[in-house]
Amino acid sequence: AESCTSRPHITVVEGEPFYLKHCSCSLAHEIETTTKSWYKSSGSQEHVELNPRSSSRIALHDCVLEFWPVELNDTGSYFFQMKNYTQKWKLNVIRRNKHSCFTERQVTSKIVEVKKFFQITCENSYYQTLVNSTSLYKNCKKLLLENNKNPTIKKNAEFEDQGYYSCVHFLHHNGKLFNITKTFNITIVEDRSNIVPVLLGPKLNHVAVELGKNVRLNCSALLNEEDVIYWMFGEENGSDPNIHEEKEMRIMTPEGKWHASKVLRIENIGESNLNVLYNCTVASTGGTDTKSFILVRKADMADIPGHVFTR
């Protein structure tokens, strides 16, 4: 069964069949005797009850209010009322683009990675029994596909597949021909599965320190799940008991990559910790990125240009 219309704000294109289905449908069947009413309000008109006599374009079936077709003047608020249950929708009917096979404001955008599986299936479950034929267009040019009931594209994406794909369903109702259009804007992008990991911030960092004090060197990177971030430092410092690597912290980015941070803590800084490279590396199978930290005694700061310092 077709799911109910739960979105409270709906935009549709003039001239197409359209329906609203309330969300207490199963309940309505149980209490057949209960009075069920549909209302519309727009501008000056408050809560006008709808029935087939209101307009030859309107049909009521159990849980559904149908428009054959929907027109610009159908814009407004719609209410379904049954006992103490009310559902409300705000309907905005927009003008059809007469110069194109689709209306730009009614396009669903999809991003597909090159070489990944790409599928478009033309289906419309609600009007399925009324559909005579369906055509699929790419950039408003009809594609010749075998199945004219549910045309489908299934392939590995190529850059040439980018474009606007419109499924147009043709159906008859009361002797009239209607069509319903669903358009997808398909953008083909480079494979995003792996990024080249990168460390954030300058590649060389002089850090002003005082002997006997502690310092925390923070290394942050943008990387893939399988990538690693680690510290390497001079061989003579390899087993320095005053050097500690803190636990790595990771946060997932909205794009599905990772932001990682790893701190090297040097306690009780001694002469042996000065002027040696502490290297932080992020590594993947595709490459590495390294940034270096050098501890410099505060007294020696004057010898180094200010722009190379991190504090």
Epitope: D227, V228, Y230, M232, E235, G238, S239, T281, A283, S284, T285, G286, G287, T288, T290
Partner: nanobody, 115 residues
Framework: EVQLVESGGGLVQAGGSLRLSCTTS????????MGWFRQTPGKQRELVAR???????SYADSVKGRFTISRDNAKNTVYLQMSSLKPEDTANYLC?????????WGQGTQVTVSS
């Protein structure tokens, strides 16, 4: 393609020992720094021990004094001697090169320490 093959894991009682091996087919093994990483489900890989081409070693605080990393360049193998094992050492152990692009990860070798 260069392959990394880890072995030597198993089930051991707390306080016990294991010796892990990692063999690579890489022709640059003798000049690569190598590291042992470990990973527990849902966590990122943590570098626990590293060894430079010159044989200098360093360790994560959590394993210092208990784990020893070594290498045999003639056999293209790096080892991790693990002693005084603790339940928190339970993980999948993997090796890889350091300081250069990672080799494709091996399957790892599972170490389980029971209390």
């Amino acid at each position: 393609e260069v392959q990394l093959v880890e072995s030597g894991g198993g089930l051991v009682q707390a306080g016990g020992s294991l010796r892990l091996s990692c063999t690579t087919s890489g022709s640059t093994f003798s000049i690569d720094a190598m590291g042992w990483f470990r990973q527990t489900p849902g966590k990122q890989r943590e570098l626990v021990a590293r060894i430079t081409n010159g044989g200098s070693t360093s360790y994560a605080d959590s394993v210092k004094g208990r784990f020893t990393i070594s290498r045999d360049n003639a056999k293209n193998t790096v080892y991790l001697q693990m002693s005084s094992l603790k339940p928190e050492d339970t993980a999948n152990y993997l090796c890889n090169v350091l300081g250069t692009a990672l080799r494709p990860w091996g399957q790892g070798t599972q170490v389980t320490v029971s209390s």
